[in-house]
């Protein structure tokens, strides 16, 4: 079940996710000047076995010179602003995804790809955040959120992040120990069925991260 | 809730254009598809041409010559460009929404639609 929505956004913040569950999908989509080949797959889809996931199909571009399909609207500065935080990260992968079953790596880029990738999560996806460089974290629980299914419907849960404005750039997962705040997750979960997966493995997984993968972007 | 309203249908005669919109509101589209069908009378809904957040087109090989699909993200807005128009372009024009990747959504997969614009060509 693809999640609804992308993950929620944070002041201040980027959001990474260290795996891929199985399912999701992920944009064929080109820099501007070029486009999907004709022939070519329209989205990469994370698939695989009880042993291995790996992405399915290949991104390509292709000069778009004889018809203009990849026009661009020049995004407006606050519009940049709201995009920041899911600007394409840097594809490396620190992680050993053996660790992680059920779940593919980052996709290396491919020729002429878009600056920014669009994902398409599904219920049970995790994502990480992390201040930006220049704001500093403060913790009132995990920072985090899980796309969950409830009552039929999908959600992101709210990562319990503030990054305030002071010149120091925490490390990630967050350094800075958590404020005091007894009632962990504000959301309150009703009798209704709950579908998350993954929640331990990928929380011990993430305390192993390096702050790198949210420091690079394509240029 | 998510409301689609198109609008720029009308009666044109054949080899002319036209240009239709639709305005989308309700919740954010950045991870969903904007998509145009058509529907003739006694005839399926057809998928004719889709458009992601970052203008990654798709179009249906009947109008790829002809249509061309954009998109206006801060307006919330996607066009559908009908050039050279022929009377067997005569349909109800639907704009679509559908999460994912641009890909051809079947019509009864489709997530939202609009109530429909009519474009009739005459010869």
């Known amino acids: 079940e693809l999640c609804d929505d992308d993950p929620p956004e944070i002041p201040h913040a980027t959001f990474k996710a260290m795996a891929y569950k199985e399912g999701t999908m992920l944009n064929c989509e080109c820099k501007r000047g070029f486009r999907r080949i004709k022939s070519g797959s329209l989205y990469m889809l994370c698939t695989g076995n009880s042993s291995h996931s790996s992405w399915d199909n290949q991104c390509q571009c292709t000069s778009s010179a004889t018809r203009n399909t990849t026009k661009q609207v020049t995004p407006q500065p606050e519009e940049q602003k709201e995009r920041k935080t899911t600007e394409m990260q840097s594809p490396m992968q620190p992680v050993d995804q053996a660790s992680l079953p059920g779940h593919c790596r980052e996709p290396p880029p491919w020729e002429n790809e878009a600056t920014e990738r669009i994902y398409h999560f599904v219920v049970g996806q995790m994502v990480y955040y992390q201040c930006v460089q220049g704001y500093r974290a403060l913790h009132r629980g995990p920072a985090e959120s899980v796309c969950k299914m409830t009552h039929g419907k999908t959600r992101w849960t709210q990562p319990q992040l503030i990054c305030t404005g002071e010149m120091e750039t925490s490390q990630f997962p967050g350094e800075e120990k958590p404020q005091a705040s007894p009632e962990g997750r504000p959301e309150s979960e009703t009798s209704c069925l709950v579908t998350t997966t993954d929640f331990q493995i990928q929380t011990e997984m993430a305390a192993t991260m390096e702050t790198s993968i949210f420091t690079t972007e394509y240029q | 809730e998510v409301q689609l309203v198109e609008s720029g249908g009308g009666l044109v005669q054949a080899g002319d254009s036209l240009r239709l919109s639709c305005a989308a509101s309700g919740r954010s589209f950045r991870n969903y598809i904007l998509a145009w069908y058509r529907q003739a009378p006694g005839k399926e809904r057809e998928f004719l041409a889709a458009?992601?957040?970052?203008?990654?087109?798709l179009y249906a090989d009947s109008v790829e010559d002809r249509f061309t699909i954009s998109r206006d993200n801060p307006k919330n807005t996607v066009h559908l460009q009908m050039d050279n128009l022929k009377p067997e372009d005569t349909a109800v024009y639907y704009c679509?929404?559908?999460?994912?990747?641009?890909?051809?959504?079947?019509?009864?997969?489709?997530?939202?639609w609009g109530q429909g614009t009519q474009v009739s060509v005459s010869s």
């Open positions: 458009i992601s957040w970052l203008d990654g087109t």
């Open positions: 679509a929404a559908d999460r994912g990747p641009v890909r051809p959504v079947l019509a009864p997969d489709v997530d939202y």
